[in-house]
């Protein structure tokens, strides 16, 4: 009889999003009588090993196509065509290859949030930094020097409260101020820098009796 899928319930995952350098296997397990043949298309055209650096592995008994060490040029629609003299069936999978291209740091929206604190209490600010390249993270506070908030070149005066290089792509950082006084009130910054650029977020602490 005509070809049919033997595992249709497992073939509903049409999109594969795969980080670059990993291995992908598309499968279209089928049966029929006589045993059907399988062929593969990429973006509607016949797909063969020579079309790809590193080639492909086809296993007709496994109804599979394997691509090792995928790269961005492997993105596209992959269609298996299974046919015998009684008919033909096909399934299309979409492959997205995720590149890890560095970007300037991203700070999670809404963090750190402004806070109002009672004199003598403890406060904690929270900043979330995302950066592909190693970021330099700083907690800063705006200060006055000789009664002025900005230097001769117009750059605000700041003091560095904490500074470190993060080893993590996703850094969850906190600034803790204990036993706050009125001097702690004012404008602060969470700043993250990598070799591509800078991201910073200003926030305020108000201290009242």
């Amino acid at each position: 009889g005509a070809p049919y899928w033997t595992r249709p319930e497992r073939m509903d995952k049409k999109l594969l999003a795969v980080p670059a350098a990993n291995t992908v296997r598309f499968r279209c397990p089928a049966a029929g009588n006589p045993t059907p043949s399988i062929s593969w298309l990429k973006n509607g055209r016949e797909f063969r090993g020579e079309h790809r650096i590193g080639g492909i592995k086809l296993a007709h008994q496994q109804w599979s196509l394997v691509m090792e060490s995928v790269v961005p040029s492997d993105r596209g629609n992959y269609t298996c065509v299974v046919e015998n003299k009684f008919g033909s069936i096909r399934q299309t999978y979409t492959l997205d290859v995720l590149e890890r291209s560095p970007h300037r740091p991203i700070l999670q929206a809404g963090l750190p949030a402004n806070q109002t604190a009672v004199l003598g209490s403890d406060v904690e600010f929270h900043c979330k930094v995302y950066s592909d390249a190693q970021p330099h993270i700083q907690w800063l506070k705006h200060v006055e020097v000789n009664g002025s908030k900005v230097g001769p070149d117009g750059t605000p005066y700041v003091t560095v409260l904490k500074s470190w290089i993060s080893e993590s792509v996703e850094a969850d950082v906190r600034l803790r101020l204990a036993n706050v006084s009125e001097r702690d009130g004012g404008e602060y910054l969470c700043r993250a820098t990598n070799f591509i650029g800078v991201a910073e977020k200003a926030f305020w602490l108000s201290v009242h009796g």
Partner: antibody, heavy 126, light 109 residues
Framework: EVQLVQSGAEVKKPGASVKVSCKAS????????ISWVRQAPGQGLEWMGW????????NYAQKFQGRVTVTTDTSTSTAYMELRSLRSEDTAVYYC???????????????????WGQGTTVTVSS | QSVLTQPPSLSVAPGKTATFTCGGN??????VHWYRQKPGQAPVLVMY???ERPSGIPERMSGSNFGNTATLTITRVEAEDEADYYC???????????FGGGTKLTVLG
């Protein structure tokens, strides 16, 4: 050539710590995780934990939780495994291995280890 | 957490077929990788995703995985196949690696 080169043999006293290094070459370090696997004399392979070289995330086998720390230094393409509070049962060969993701349209994703270091012998003896 | 069971030993005459089994509850729903470890050496990946051979691994090796048993088969066994063979799965629930206990292949003669 893709390879992982591990630090040399260590002899430690019970209660001490050991830190084994694993230097990668021949590929982009941050594209693959690193797993650590140990093998006691005459025994099978025992998975200890793994680290994402991309974001530093770690995952440890329950047995080693709290006693092992796996880290990476992307600037030198090196992974480290530190095991603390050593006991005689920790005498083993310790391997690092590159973790590769396999994505299958039917079965989903799976991880395996496609390149292994040569192993580091750690002997714990008083 | 998955538990994988392998027979501890297997003896096969040269030229014959060696069949390694790896038992686990519904292991057929997972993908299995196989490693070969020769004495004094690090393990080597010989099969991934049940049936796929890495480059450099001879066609004499094949794999399958159905129901509660995954299988690695070596046809025309040679003396150089003598080694320990380990199956491995990835437990996606816990993000943990799980190894079988290993099977020691002895090539007779």
């Amino acid at each position: 050539e893709v390879q992982l080169v591990q630090s040399g043999a260590e002899v430690k006293k019970p209660g001490a710590s050991v830190k084994v290094s694993c230097k990668a070459s021949g590929y982009m370090f941050t594209s693959y995780g690193i797993s650590w696997v140990r093998q006691a004399p005459g025994q099978g392979l025992e998975w200890m934990g793994w680290v994402s070289t991309y974001n530093g995330d770690t995952n440890y086998a329950q047995k080693f939780q709290g006693r092992v720390t796996v880290t990476t230094d992307t600037s030198t393409s090196t992974a480290y495994m530190e095991l603390r509070s050593l006991r005689s049962e920790d005498t083993a060969v310790y391997y690092c291995a590159r973790v590769l993701g396999y994505y299958d349209s039917i079965d989903g994703y799976y991880y395996g280890m496609d390149v292994w270091g040569q192993g580091t012998t750690v002997t714990v003896s008083s | 957490q998955s538990v994988l069971t392998q027979p501890p030993s297997l003896s096969v005459a040269p030229g014959k077929t060696a069949t390694f089994t790896c038992g686990g509850n519904n292991i057929g729903d997972k993908s299995v990788h196989w490693y070969r470890q020769k004495p004094g050496q690090a393990p080597v990946l010989v099969m991934y995703l049940d049936t796929e051979r890495p480059s450099g691994i001879p066609e004499r090796m094949s794999g399958s995985n159905f129901g509660n048993t995954a299988t690695l088969t070596i046809t025309r066994v040679e003396a150089e196949d003598e080694a320990d063979y380990y199956c491995q799965v990835w437990d996606s629930g816990s993000d943990h690696v799980v190894f079988g206990g290993g099977t020691k292949l002895t090539v007779l003669g």
